[in-house]
Amino acid sequence: TLSTPLSKRTSGFPAKKRALELSGNSKNELSRSKRSWMWNQFFLLEEYTGSDYQYVGKLHSDQDRGDGSLKYILSGDGAGDLFIINENTGDIQATKRLDREEKPVYILRAQAINRRTGRPVEPESEFIIKIHDINDNEPIFTKEVYTATVPEMSDVGTFVVQVTATDADDPTYGNSAKVVYSILQGQPYFSVESETGIIKTALLNMDRENREQYQVVIQAKDMGGQMGGLSGTTTVNITLTDVNDNPPRFPQSTYQFKTPESSPPGTPIGRIKASDADVGENAEIEYSITDGEGLDMFDVITDQETQEGIITVKKLLDFEKKKVYTLKVEASNPHVEPRFLYLGPFKDSATVRIVVEDVDEPPVFSKLAYILQIREDAQINTTIGSVTAQDPDAARNPVKYSVDRHTDMDRIFNIDSGNGSIFTSKLLDRETLLWHNITVIATEINNPKQSSRVPLYIKVLDVNDNAPEFAEFYETFVCEKAKADQLIQTLRAVDKDDPYSGHQFSFSLAPEAASGSNFTIQDNKDNTAGILTRKNGYNRHEMSTYLLPVVISDNDYPVQSSTGTVTVRVCACDHHGNMQSCHAEALIHPTGLSTGA
């Protein structure tokens, strides 16, 4: 067991007398804060520079009679290297300079062994060597260079950044590690709290627009800042961040731009730029047109990249209507800081004068499209109608008209180049083509490059110039045993004309066939007619085929009629009326053919 001399013992240890005692640099450090006194401690000064080994203390066993029979052995941290023991006397020495900051405590074990028996005379005892601090370390900042920001125009005492320096010396002993901060460079702009290292603003109205960067040098000194203390420094680079303390300002009060009257909506006319000494969002500018005759004719948009106001055309301009516009444009900050409103409104106005330039425009037709009508029986050179185009320019240049021949390859129509009258140059047929779509060109006589086109839609009106005809070729049959007034075929007619009130056809047997006919025609008054038998029974051996001439007439003016022939064959039929033979010729049933059986 290990102990200090009995005079330094405190109560609480085992009653059994300790045989292995410890004496030397052990100290009863009752005054030291946070550290209870330990009986088994040696204290050793760090960074000892003497020429001899530094004496630590002495181990002694009660059983040591001084005859050299006891051997003292040291083991643990640094034993045999940093710390050596005189195996006969128990004296402990430190062989090297010790650095508390490298290792503040060494834990060693002591043994006293009887050389003659090889047996330990005591159990192993543990003791501590504490390295006593000296002020051999300067404060070191956690960063060589700090970077910080603080808003411009901040109140005095605004927190900027906290710098921290650490001192490797013992903070629990003396002032070797008690650090005090001071400012070496950066006054009168900034100050530092000596205890905390908090840097604050020290000057009112620091304006970023005036100066943006500050380099502050802070010193940390130990020994509470007293003379003889060690010190370290750090650099703090402080940047003033922007606040919106500057309004936008137009560099000139009036701007003038020109734009051709032909500029379509959305066309940029020009750019205006208000300058703002602030940066970032504080320098963002919104432009608006607040007044002027062009309020509804122009727009202003903000270019987000350049913070310019772009004046654009909102509606179509007309030089002939208005040649000059005056606008009032306002530039304002969208992000305003209320505390700076006392500096005045964060906006500015300028006058923008826009001159509309005349553009030689092509002729303009009185209509976007023309629809004309003409009867299909119109003679050549019949006038259909006319078109009108005018030069919109102030000059009112004369115009000549022409037909775009790509749209009238057959040259059916012509136009009077002077007055725009459209007339026929060929006969028309509605049944061939109902609509003619042509394009008329109006060209300025003095400037043939200026031309416009307009579509003409010409409708050909119907004239009754086509006779009705059978809808199909009719060939039917009649059974030999047919009864009188039997329907053997229904007739239908078609007409190429398109009368206003619709078709009304009449059917009749041709006059030459009407008397003594074996068949009759019955007009159904619905544009169909039926062929009926006129007698009972037919003899195919007497007459195998009948040809019936039928006259079909319309009721339009002038009346048109045509004669069509219906062929009727006489056939042998079974008792169901199904055809069996017709003179050994096979009769093909046309589609829709009624047998009339």
Epitope: I113, G118, P120
Partner: antibody
Framework: EVQLQQSGPELVKPGASVRISCKAS????????MNWVKQSHGKSLEWIGD????????TYNQKFKGKATLTVDKSSSTAYMELRSLTSEDSAVYSC????????????WGQGTLVTVSA | QIVLTQSPALMSASPGEKVTMTCSAS?????MYWYQQKPRSSPKPWIY???NLASGVPARFSGSGSGTSYSLTISSMEAEDAATYYC?????????FGSGTKLEIK
């Protein structure tokens, strides 16, 4: 070279006594205590006691007091152990051993003496 | 007296295998000593003051423990390590030995 040379084996009758010797060489005989150890056949070791050759002071294991007597002869660097009132329980190998701490700890043993107690 | 109990009494290990044997004291001792004994030979000092190797003992051996619990460890068993190992205390008279652990090679 350190050597502890023990006397030869002994065959003795029950009730008799025997004296075993241990001659030390290779070191200063008086510098280190001499220990005696018993090892019965197939069994463990038992410490009998030790003697300081300097002054003939002895320490015994209570179990062997009255059974063993330790002596030394400094002039011949020899240690002796006498065993009396022998019984079959005393049949064993008896070894002398010297332990000490010089530069490092050491322990030297004799080769052992077999004592057989038999009628 | 202090009784030292060794376990296991008998054990076998393959070459290269790690081996640990223990010695338990009936009451606390300051240090433990270990001896190696091979058949027909005297014991040899092996470990002293709990963890120190005696002269000539291979570094694969180590000792540790305190109070009532101690152990001897061989990091990598070799054939020559086959023997009986005894623990012993010098803390209290009578100075007693353990009953031994016999270590065999597989």
């Amino acid at each position: 070279e350190v050597q502890l040379q023990q006397s030869g084996p002994e065959l003795v009758k029950p009730g008799a006594s025997v004296r075993i010797s241990c001659k030390a060489s290779g070191y200063t005989f008086t510098d280190y205590y001499m220990n005696w150890v018993k090892q019965s056949h197939g069994k463990s070791l038992e410490w009998i006691g030790d003697i300081d050759p300097n002054n003939a002071n002895t320490t015994y294991n209570q179990k062997f007091k009255g059974k063993a007597t330790l002596t030394v002869d400094k002039s011949s660097s020899t240690a002796y152990m006498e065993l009396r009132s022998l019984t079959s329980e005393d049949s064993a190998v008896y070894s002398c051993a010297s332990f000490g701490y010089d530069v490092e700890w050491f322990g030297y043993w004799g080769q052992g003496t077999l004592v057989t107690v038999s009628a | 007296q202090i009784v030292l109990t060794q376990s296991p009494a008998l054990m076998s290990a393959s070459p290269g295998e790690k081996v640990t044997m223990t010695c338990s004291a009936s009451s606390s001792v300051s240090y433990m000593y270990w001896y190696q004994q091979k058949p027909r030979s005297s014991p040899k000092p092996w470990i002293y003051l709990t963890s120190n190797l005696a002269s000539g003992v291979p570094a694969r051996f180590s000792g540790s423990g305190s109070g009532t619990s101690y152990s001897l460890t061989i990091s990598s068993m070799e054939a020559e390590d086959a023997a009986t190992y005894y623990c012993q205390q010098w803390s209290s008279n009578p100075f007693t030995f353990g009953s031994g652990t016999k270590l065999e090679i597989k």
